[in-house]
Structures are given as C-alpha cells and as structure tokens.
C-alpha cells in the first residue's frame, strides 16, 4: 500500500497506518484487512461507516488521533477490539448497534465527564472496558447491566466520589476491577456481591473510616490477597498484593482493613443478609468464636490476571496481551465451598489447574480431632505473586500433555512467634501453639495466591481436622491437603453441581460446627 504498511500475523492481515499525519481513512486499503492501526494521526472526527467495506475487520486502533467526535453509523459485524484511548472525546458514543461483537473497548484518557444510562446497551459481548483517566464523577446504576460477560473493568484515575451499590450485579466473570486514584470515600454495602474478585486495585482514594466503612473493611479482610497496588510499567511478576494500600483518609493513613470500628453496631458490616451468605461479624464470647462461615465462590471460567489469562489445562488460551481481543469460551461449573470465618486456606490455589467436572455431588468428610488453641496470623500486607512459568504469552498448547505437578518453594507468610503473635491480645500458651509450617504448593502457572487472612484474636479456637479435604475426586488436579495450621473446623463438604442461578450454598453444604 502506498501509505500504510501491510503484513500478516497468524493469518491476520494487519495494516499499519500509524503516524502518517492522516486526516481521514486512506483510500484503497486491503479489503481483507483484519487489524487496522490508525494511531497517532490527526483525524479529529471519524466515521465508523467508512470501515464498512472491510468486512473482516476485528481490531481497530484509533488512539492518539485528537478525536473529538466518533460517528457511529453502519455496522462492523466482527470488530472485537476498539481502542479510542488518548483522544478528546467528551461523550461516549453509543456503540451497541454498530459494534455488536465488541469484546474490548478502551476509552481511557479522554474527557468523559459522565456516562448515560444506556451507554453500553447492545454490547453484550464486552469483556474488557477501560475508562481510566477520564473526568467521571458518578456512574449510572445500571451502567453494566448490558455487559454480563465483563471480565476487566478499569475506572481508575477519575473523579468518582461514589459508586452505585448494584454496579457489579450480574458480572459473574469479573476478575479485575481497577478503582485506584479516584475520590471514593466509601463502598456501598453489598457492592462486591459474593463472587470472587481476584484482582482489585483500590488505593489512592480518600476512604472515610466510620461505621459506614465496615462492610468494605470486612471485604478487605476477606480478600486481602486480592487487593493490589498498580505500578505503571512494573512487570507482572513484581506486582504484589497489598491490602494495607487501602488507607483511611481521616486517620493518618491507617489501613481500612484494620479500622477498629469502635462504637459501631456489632453487625455493622454485615449489611444485607445475602452479602456473605449470612456472614456476620465474629461475636466473641470469652475464648470462643460463634459458628460463622464464609462462602468462597469460584467464577465460571478460568481466572485471568490484569495482564493476561491464567491458562487452564483444559481451556485453550487466547490473546495474552492487555487489552486482549479474545477470550476463552469454555466454562467450568460454578463452585461454592465453605471455609472458617475470615480466612481462606493457607495454600497456593491454582485456579487454572482445577477443572470442575459436571458430575454428581461428591463429598469428603474429614474426621474431627481434639481442639487445639492456635493463633491465626494476621494477613501479611505485602505478598508477592509467584513467578508465572511459562509466561502468559507462551503457554503450553492444549494439544501437548499437561505437565505433572511439581512442588516448588512454598510461598508462606512470616510465621508469628508462638508466644507473641502479631495480633496482640493475650499471649497464646506455648504448648498448644506450634509454629505454623509452610504449605506446599502445586506448581502450575500462573498462580493465584490464597493464604490465611484472619483477624481473629489469638484466643480464637478452632476444631482441627486430620483428614485431607478434597473438593472433588474427579477434578484433574486437587487442592493440596489442609493438614497444617490454620486448622479447619468441622466438616467441609462441596456439592459441585450447584445451579448457576442459586447464589447461595446448596443445602448439602455442611455448616461449620459451633463450639
């Protein structure tokens, strides 16, 4: 082509018209273009209708083009990725009718001040939405209702002061939420729902620590290893979880997850009864903790990091770049598992290596053993993710045999001294508090770290189990045994055929036994 560079990559005809000082679409582009780069031109206004002859177009880059207006007319039936970042758009065009197949939309670093309620109507395939670096102050409550497949949402670096309570409702596949660097002072009760959110970025907001923050405090405690700090240009391997990065603005940068909440109602962070499946604040009586339980829900598909997919042995991995243009469609069944209050098992959980089978329910009942009094360590604020092997950009192909699990150096938290545990209160008696031993991990890659995240005082008492806990015998890889502290109390049962429509535990799940 006389103006643009034409090449092919993996059967995609890629046309690069970047930095050509173009003011309009160049004429006579190849009709079979699948990827079109028009970045860093001087387009000012652009009509998507001009691209209708390019029926194979799957990716369009219009970033850094000084766009003040994008005309949406015609239809681009297979366009999956649209990059409009670093432009001057003051309103988000209604793309639904024009781009019905859109999976990735990047409108970062524009001049959006608000979004209309129906801004995303018709974008039912959208998986990634990037709105970072705009001037958004509020969001309409049902903004994301039309995008149930959303996996990544970035609202970072805006002027958001509040969030609608139901913003994330129905987003069962959401794995990455970026809310850092806004003006948020609280999180409405029930905001996060009950599904697992592996990657949340929440720092750089003026969190107001009062009784209204207790729901958020509780969520942070339960999801400590899922809260990360965003560092521009930092390699994924160096990203660390850091729940302490979420700090009270009115309390000398005190971490929200440690906010004492003195004087607040006992059940102040319970919120609506369905938030944690009847999951109240611990009510301590002397040295005992009343029976409570946590619901850990596994999303319906392989987890992804903010930087790419966690490749499942059974799921073909797709584009590892971010934003990526395509994602897996294979789903595993939704799983729900109960664990003791305020902590998740201290082992490395490899979501990509667990393939849940649609088989009749299978349960394992561990045998309880005598009570021991043990301190449960406070979450270490900084936990570094294990280095992925292989890199997300070059995973093992699914046609190759899955490698056997190996056991690398375990990633464990600093073990507190037996007699002086970090959560100060009464020192736990030495004889009954052996030092926690590291938990072995199954090395697959990449990994999600899930480790003990308890804020229960040292005098909390759990019954222990000696029998390994298995989620499902028919899984391709099972979770490592839970035979080290912290101990699991009572019986853990999993009914792994729960209905997609039932947000609560199946009746067959056994409760945690009260003391």
């Amino acid at each position: 082509h006389p103006i643009c560079e034409v090449s092919k990559v993996a059967s995609h005809l890629e046309v690069n018209c970047d930095k050509r000082n173009l003011t309009a679409l160049p004429p006579d582009l190849p009709k079979d273009t699948t990827i079109l780069h028009l970045s860093e031109n001087l387009l000012y206004t652009f009509s998507l209708a001009t691209l209708m002859p390019y029926t194979r177009l799957t990716q369009l880059n219009l970033d850094r083009c000084e766009l003040t207006k994008l005309q949406v007319d015609g239809t681009l039936p297979v366009l999956g990725t649209l990059d409009l970042s670093h432009n001057q758009l003051q309103s988000l065009p209604l793309l639904g009718q024009t781009l019905p197949a859109l999976t990735v939309l990047d409108v970062s670093f524009n001049r959006l001040t608000s979004l209309p309620l129906g801004a995303l109507r018709g974008l039912g395939e959208l998986q990634e939405l990037y709105l970072k670096g705009n001037e958004l102050k509020t969001l309409p409550p049902g903004l994301l209702t039309p995008t149930p497949k959303l996996e990544k949402l970035s609202l970072a670096n805006n002027n958001l002061t509040e969030l609608p309570a139901g913003l994330l409702n129905g987003l069962e596949n959401l794995d990455t939420l970026l809310l850092q660097e806004n003006s948020l002072y609280t999180i409405p009760k029930g905001f996060f729902g009950s599904h697992l959110l592996p990657f949340a970025f929440l720092h750089g907001n003026p969190w107001l620590c009062n009784c209204e923050i207790l729901y958020f405090r509780r969520w942070l405690q339960d999801n400590a290893e899922n809260v990360y700090v965003w560092k521009q240009g930092v390699d994924v391997k160096a990203m660390t979880s850091n729940v302490a990065s979420v700090q009270c603005d009115n309390s000398d940068k005190f971490p929200v997850y440690k906010y004492p909440g003195k004087g607040c109602p006992t059940l102040g962070d319970e919120g609506d009864t369905d938030l944690y499946d009847y999951y109240p604040e611990e009510d301590t009586e002397g040295d005992k903790v009343r029976a409570t339980r946590t619901v850990v829900k596994f999303p319906t598909k392989a987890h992804t990091t903010p930087w790419g997919l966690f490749y499942s042995w059974s799921t073909a991995s797709l584009d590892s770049q971010m934003p990526s243009s395509l994602h897996p469609t294979q789903e595993s069944t939704k799983e729900q598992t109960t664990f003791p209050p305020r902590w998740t098992p201290n082992f490395t959980l490899h979501m990509e290596s667990i393939t849940f089978s649609k088989t009749p329910k299978s349960t394992t009942e561990p045998t309880p053993s005598p009570t021991t009094s043990e301190p449960v360590p406070e979450p270490a604020p900084n936990m570094t993710t294990l280095e992925p092997t292989p890199s997300p950009t070059t995973p093992e192909p699914t046609s190759e045999p899955a490698p056997s699990p190996t056991t690398p150096e375990p990633t464990s938290e600093p073990a507190p001294s037996p007699t002086t545990p970090e959560p100060t209160s009464e020192p736990a008696p030495s004889p009954t508090t052996p030092e926690p031993t590291p938990i072995p991990t199954i090395a697959t890659s990449p990994t999600i770290l899930v480790s003990a995240t308890s804020l229960i005082t040292p005098k909390s008492t759990f019954l222990t189990t000696t029998k390994p806990v298995s989620l499902l015998e028919s899984t391709k890889k099972t979770i490592p045994e839970l035979d080290q502290p912290p101990k699991l109390r009572g019986v853990l049962q999993g009914h792994l055929e729960s209905s997609r429509n039932d947000p609560f535990l199946h009746p067959d799940f056994c409760c945690l036994l009260p003391l």
């Epitope: 034409v6 090449s7 092919k8 990559v9 993996a10 059967s11 005809l13 190849p30 009709k31 079979d32 273009t33 997919l309 073909a316 991995s317 797709l318 584009d319 590892s320 243009s325 395509l326 997300p392 950009t393 070059t394 995973p395 192909p397 699914t398 046609s399």
Partner: antibody, heavy 118, light 113 residues
Framework: EVQLVESGGGLVQPGGSLRLSCAAS????????MSWVRQAPGKGLEWVSS???????YYPDSVLGRFTISRDNSKNTLYLQMNSLRAEDTAVYYC????????????WGQGTLVTVSS | DIVMTQSPLSLPVTPGEPASISCKSS????????????LAWYLQKPGQSPQLLIY???TRESGVPDRFSGSGSGTDFTLKISRVEAEDVGVYYC?????????FGQGTKVEIK
Amino acid sequence: EVQLVESGGGLVQPGGSLRLSCAASGFTFSSFAMSWVRQAPGKGLEWVSSITSAGTPYYPDSVLGRFTISRDNSKNTLYLQMNSLRAEDTAVYYCAKSRGYEDYFDYWGQGTLVTVSS
Amino acid sequence: DIVMTQSPLSLPVTPGEPASISCKSSQSLLNSRNQKNYLAWYLQKPGQSPQLLIYFTSTRESGVPDRFSGSGSGTDFTLKISRVEAEDVGVYYCQQHYSSPWTFGQGTKVEIK
C-alpha cells in the same frame, strides 16, 4: 489434480526487468492466497511475495518497491513483475499455493530460472 | 524478521534407523488465541520442488507417511523420522508461517550413509 506451471524466466542484465507467470489449474484459483518463493543456486528457500485471495500484496524488505505481485482470477494466473533486477535475484522462482488464509505452501510449481548477469 | 535456525545442516542416516532434525525460531511461533504453533516442514528431494510434509507443527499433510512426525512449541521444534527409508533423502526445511515475512531455515541435508 493441482498444477502450477511457471514461465517467463531467463537471462537478464542487472537493472533490467522480467515478468514471471504461473498458470494454475485443478483448484478454485480465486479462493486461495498465492506466493512466489525463490531458491538461489545451491542455497535455501526465500519467500519473495504473496497475494491474498482478495488481492492484497505483501513483500519482504528485500524486494519491496522492486517486485510487484498480481493475479488475474479470470485467467487463473499469478504474476510477478520484477524490476531493477540485481545479481542477488538470480534464483529458481517457484509459484506456490497457500491453503486457505494460512501461509504455508501446500503445492509448488516446478520453478523457472531467472539469471541476472551482465 | 523471525530467524529460523536448523540443526544439523547435514545428517547421514542408516535406512531403518530413526532421524531427528531440530528447528529453532528467534521468537515464539505460538498464537495464544488458538494455541497453534505456526511452523511447517518441507522436503525437497534432489532435482524436485519442495513438498509440504507438516504444518502447524504436528499436522501431517495428506499422503505423507506416518513415519514423519513433528513436535515442539514456542521456539523449539523437531521433525522426526521413525524409520528412514531411501526415498526420504533430500533437504528438509522448516518455515514459520506465523508472521510475515515468512522465513525458512537453512535446510538440513539428509543422505544415506
């Protein structure tokens, strides 16, 4: 049976021009990408140019601006117009068919020799 | 451009014995969208045009004997002949069909001892 027959090779002086043709039969020519691959005497294979079924050409840097690939679907013929020829362009030029939209070559012609020499 | 490097450049073989040729690429040929490695193998018999043996690393072309097999992922690939026959002599080329410009290895000459 798929057949690819090249013609148009010969001796040409440096700076000169030559046009190669490839007559295709035994398949729906218009549906497939086509390519030229060359092999210098005693050397390995080198891709020269491709054209998609929709007519989009692309080239390596070594021939960009000097060679032009084209096709006439009505004649089931692939062409390679070679200008500003150099001694290093001396090679056997093969016409090759791609499978679908992929870029490996499932059928090759017998080749035509182009010699650039003064 | 992606550089393809083959080894060995010459491979004397005994009929009935196995043979193996290595091909390395300067960057990954794995398309993470579909988990395919975009690598093909060709055989050019003496005095003939090249013929396709294997594409997408391990898929045998129709009519190619099953004694030929391809494997590998990312940047390291291998062509194996389980039992070499006399008709297998010639020059074997690997080619990446991942990213233009399409590039070939230097070739491995297989000859009977």
